[in-house]
Each structure stands twice: as C-alpha cells, then as structure tokens.
C-alpha cells in the first residue's frame, strides 16, 4: 500500500471524518487540500487499497491568477446504501512530485439492526412430520440472538436460549406460522412470517380387493390430516404397456391418466370401464382443507383374463358322405383375454352331442359315425380364454357338399348359454 | 462496549422493600431479554426474574409476590423491587442481559435493623 | 420445577489435570444447558451455552456436552486460573435453575 512520506510537510489541510450507520445510509466522506502549481489528482483508499471505482468528486479552486498560485483542492467520496463491505479506513492519496501523501484516517462503521440473511419460508408438510426451518441475521454489531416464535408464542423462554440458525419442527397437526426474531445491542428485527400448510400424509398400503375384466376395487390406509379430515381422496390409472417411465421412476404417467375421485370414508374404490387382461399403474392421493397429500408410488395392478364377448364368426359346414368340414373366423367381439382355442360341439337329430377342444386351428374335418346316415347334424363353435368359454354360435346345419359349389357360410349367433354337455364314445 | 451497574441502597430493614437500578450502556434494552440474579453469601446462584425487551416479566415462583421487575427505556435503565425483605434476602444482586454475556458487577444488599 | 443436580460439589486438582462436571435435570431439557464459572468476589462468567457452545473468548480447553437430561463439563487441561466455582442453568422452563455449584480447588 502506498505509504506518506514525512521529508515534507502534509498538503492535507482536512481529513475524513467518520461515518456510523446502519445498512442503507448515504454519507460523504471529505478531505481537502492546499497545492502550489498544477493541482494533483486526489485518490481515495480503504484499508490501504486503492479504490478503482470511488464515486468521488474533486473541486478545484485557484487562490491567485497565476497557475503557479496556491490551489485549494476538495475531494468527496459518496458512500451510497451502506454496506458491511463499505466499512474500514479511509484515507485520501495524492502524489505531489516524487512524494506520496496520505492524509489521516476517517473510519466507516455498520452499526445498526439486526440484517437478516436467510428468513423462513413458506411450505407445505405433511401432518405429524419431522422438518426443518432457518433463520440467520447479521449485526453489526454482535452477538445477535435469535428467538423463534410459533403462531407469535415464543419457543424459548429467552433470546439466544432456543434453536438458533435451525428449527427442528417434530411435527404439526394444524396449519401454523413460523418467525423469528434478532436482538442486538440496536434493537430487535422481526423476520418475515413463514406459513407452514399441513397437508394430509401419504396414503400407505394402496391394494387390489377384487378384480374383474372390467373393474378394480383398490383400497388404501389413509395418512394422518392433523386436525383437518380428508374431503376425499382421488385414484389415478394409467395403462402401462407403454409405462416404461413409470418403471423408471418418472413422477408423471406417459398419458392422461384415468381419474376418480372417492369419498371418505370408506377408503375404497371401484374403477370401471377398464380393459380386460391389461396391465395398469394406479397411484392414490387424500385432500383436506387445506390440500391434497403426495400421491402414492405408482402400483402395478393388472386385469383379469374375461371370457370371449362372442362366437366365431363366419362358420362354414359341408358333409360328404361320412365327414364333415367345419372352420370359422376368430370371433369379432373382443376376446378379454389371450385366445387359447375352440370347441366344438355337434348333434344328430337323435344322438348324443359330441364335444371337441379344436385347439387354436379355425378348421376341423370330422369323422361321423356310422356311414354318415345321421339325419339333421348340426355344429355349434365357441372360443375360450384362460377365464372360460365364450358365447356358443347357433348351431350351424351341415349341408350336403356338390361340387363346384362354394361351401355355404352362416353368420347365425346362438345366445350365450352353455350346451348340456355330454361325453359320448368319441 | 457494553456495561451493566447496579444501584441502590446496601442495607435494609426487614419488611420494607428493597429497590435495585440496572443502567445499561451500549446496548438497548429494547432489545433481548434483561434479568436480575443473586446470591446470599457463601451460597449458590438463584434466579429472580426478567422483563421482556417489550416490557413483559417472568418471575421465579417462589418469589413472584413479592418482586416487580420494571424498565425505563428513556434512560435505558431496569429495575427490582422486592417488598417484605427478610434476613433471607441478604445477597449479592446482579443484573444481566439474559444470554449471559454481560453482567453488573453486583452489589451487595444486606437486610438487618 | 426442575432441579439441577450438580456433581461432585468440590474436587481437587492440579495443573494440566483433565476435569470433569456434570449436571443432571430433574426431567429433559433439550440442551438448554449453560456453564458459568465464577471466581470470588465476580460475577459469574459465560462458558458454554446450548449445552454445547463455547462462549466468545472463552478457551478451547473448556467444552460441554450432554443431551436430554445429563450434561457434562469438562476442562481438558486444568489451568491455574481455571481454579473456581463452576454452575450449570438450565433455561428450558421457567423458573430458570441453577445447579448447587462445583469448587475446585488446588490439590
């Protein structure tokens, strides 16, 4: 730092002053000179630094008409909006030849109110769950203590006696305000007012009661609400063969998710409309007052395997002599489920009725008894899944084939009921 | 730099009231927490009472009836009154900003006829 | 109220010596503990604070310990102006409460 010579005497003919504020002050610190000839230039330091970006001001005023006269010479340093790192010594520097010059040190002090550098915020928490708050405030001067205050009732008996930077809250039950207080040697400052919103906990043990092709009834434990009852609660489905960002933990479905709202209690709910056989992800979520709780983890939850909604279609039965061609089409009504085959049932106008499991071929020849003499045969085709049989067709009449004719096809639907099965020497 | 001192007569009659004067200098007492603490001669430390930088008090139980703890922010002064005084009350009185980081230098006050 | 049981009420010790106080609350007070030490004639002097904080200026060889209802004060290496009588307050609940007091003595 540049350091005053003593070989000649001072030019300074007044020093800065001091300035104590607090934060935000403006102030002028002032030092003036007396030169002979050309005026120097005045630069200010703080601490022995050079300030490079002194907002000063320089007045230059002539005590004779020659330029070789005295020179009376004013420098200010504006400080504006007083801050901690304006504080320390300030000393005015001019260089008048080959000396330097330092006048005498003003002092800039932050004396004041407590400053607060970090204040509670708002948030939100479940009921009866652990979390944590900050405050922290500044002097000069210090020590500043704080104190911590709930719903305006403090939580020590004394500044500086409680938690300090951090509030450990064990847990609320009711929505409730949060502040703190700083004391010093000044005053108090008051920090803002933080509202911590209680919030239903997360709903635990979300499961399947019971599952049909259509419809899930799902139920939950619901979480603590303090002293808010829950409204209702809101179950999300989302089909999940495409829900590989719901496996890899993504906090959003891919899709619009299906959603339904339950009252409570009972903590339970049908979902409807589903698909059969189709895997879902759901998730759960209770509201009170004053909000809804987290959802849930996504649940992988699946549909059962229903029966076939309707026969096969397009049946086709021609005879020749002692055998039978039947085949079909793959039913047009929606499987509910993975298609493991046919059956096939016929019946002469006097014989017991045959059943056969076809497997997943949509074509059979049949060997009839006999020499093919039965009267008025008749073939009946149903599909089945895993859950069961679907619909029978109506029965079909095996027609006589003639060559050259096209094989005649019935489109007729039998209603659902399941033929007198009986198990025939076949 | 902040002081505390204590005031007010070292000797009282049994049954009058003995008044104490803390002047603080250096430090408001608008702010934080300010109390007195004594201790009878030769004993352990006991808690009086504090008044509040907003003017409210606390005060120990076992003697809440008879003390009074009031302030003078204009002169940046607190004081104690502890009425019907008995030879159990010879001590010496201290004030003190309650974090404990500055205290009086106490003053003794003996209660005797 | 809640009562402060200091131990031991006095012990002897020499220079360089490792000293050790405890005080124990009549219920849990949550590190609303502090120390104070005080030589004759002077008010008492802030040690430790919230049972575990060492006071502006005071030397590291005091530190404090403790939680719930038992804390401890222990000077690492006893020093000759250490030579006093030692409190615990306890300022969860009113009324404050001081312990009996510890003097330590030169051996």
């Known amino acids: 730092a540049p350091r005053g010579t003593q070989a000649e005497e001072s030019p300074f003919v007044g020093n800065p002053g001091n300035i104590t504020g607090a934060r935000g002050l403006t102030g002028t610190l002032r030092c003036q000179l007396q030169v002979q000839g050309e005026p120097p230039e005045v630069h200010w330091l703080r601490d022995g630094q050079i300030l490079e970006l002194a907002d000063s001001t320089q007045t230059q005023v002539p005590l004779g008409e020659d330029e070789q006269d005295d020179w009376i010479v004013v420098s200010q340093l504006r400080i504006t909006s007083l801050q901690l790192s304006d504080t320390g010594q300030y000393q005015c520097l001019v260089f008048l030849g080959h000396q330097t010059f330092v006048s005498q040190p003003g002092y800039v002090g932050l004396e004041g109110l407590p400053y607060f550098l970090e204040e509670p915020e708002d948030r939100t928490v479940a009921a009866n769950t652990p979390f944590n708050l900050s405050c922290q405030a500044q002097g000069p001067p210090e020590p500043v203590d704080l104190l911590w205050l709930q719903d305006a009732v403090p939580l020590a008996t004394a500044p500086g006696h409680g938690p300090q930077r951090s509030l450990h809250v064990p847990g609320l039950n009711k929505t409730s305000s949060f502040s703190c207080e700083a004391h010093n040697a000044k005053g108090v400052t008051t920090s803002r007012t933080a509202t911590i919103t209680v919030l239903p906990q997360q709903p635990r043990n979300l499961h399947l009661v019971s599952r049909q092709p259509t419809e899930l009834e799902v139920a939950w434990t619901p979480g603590l609400s303090g002293i808010y009852p829950l409204t209702h609660c809101t179950l999300q489905a989302v089909l999940s063969d495409d829900g590989m960002g719901i496996q890899a933990g993504e906090p959003d479905p891919p899709e619009e998710p299906l959603t339904s709202q339950a009252s409570v209690p009972p903590h339970q709910l049908r979902l409807g409309s589903l698909h059969p056989h189709t895997p879902y992800h759901i998730r759960v979520a209770c509201t009170s007052s004053q909000g809804p709780s987290s959802w849930t983890h996504w649940l992988p939850v699946e549909t059962p395997e229903g029966v076939p909604l309707g026969p096969p279609e397009n049946i086709s039965a021609t005879r020749n002599g002692s055998q039978a061609f039947v085949h079909w089409q793959e039913p047009r009504a929606p499987l509910q489920g993975t298609l493991l085959g046919y059956r096939l049932a016929y019946q002469g106008q006097d014989t017991p009725e045959v059943l056969m499991d076809i497997g997943l071929r949509q074509e059979v020849t049949l060997e009839l008894q006999g020499d093919g003499s039965v009267s008025n045969l008749t073939v009946c085709v149903a599909a089945y899944t895993a859950a069961g049989d679907g619909p029978w067709s109506l029965p079909v009449p095996l027609e006589a084939w003639r060559p050259g004719e096209a094989q005649p096809v019935h489109q007729l639907v039998k209603e659902p009921s399941t033929p007198a099965f009986s198990w025939p020497w076949w | 730099q902040v002081q505390l001192q204590e005031s007010g007569p070292g000797l009282v009659k049994p049954s009058e009231t003995l008044s104490l004067t803390c002047t603080v200098s250096g430090y408001s007492i608008t702010s934080n927490y300010w109390g007195w603490i004594r201790q009878p001669p030769g004993k352990g430390l006991e808690w009086i009472g504090y008044i509040t930088y907003s003017g409210s008090t606390s005060y120990n139980p076992s003697l809440k009836s008879r003390v009074t703890i009031s302030r003078d922010t204009s002169k940046n002064q607190f004081s104690l009154k502890l009425s019907s005084v008995t030879a159990a009350d010879t001590a010496v009185y201290y004030c003190?900003?309650?974090?404990?980081?500055?205290w009086g230098q106490g003053t003794l006050v003996t209660v005797s006829s | 109220d809640i009562q402060m049981t200091q131990s031991p009420s006095s012990l002897s010790a020499s220079v360089g010596d490792r000293v050790t106080i405890t005080c124990r609350a009549s219920q849990d007070i949550g590190n609303y503990l502090r120390w104070f030490q005080q030589k004759p004639g002077k008010a008492p002097k802030l040690l430790i604070s919230?049972?575990?904080n060492l006071a502006a200026g005071v030397p590291s060889r005091f530190s404090g310990s403790g939680s719930g209802s038992d804390y401890t004060l222990t000077i690492s290496s006893l020093q000759p102006e250490d030579f006093a009588t030692y409190y615990c307050?306890?300022?969860?609940?009113?009324?404050?409460?001081f312990g009996q007091g510890t003097k330590v003595e030169i051996k």
């Open positions: 919230g049972a575990t």
């Open positions: 307050l306890q300022s969860k609940e009113s009324p404050w409460t």
């Open positions: 003190a900003i309650t974090t404990f980081y500055y």
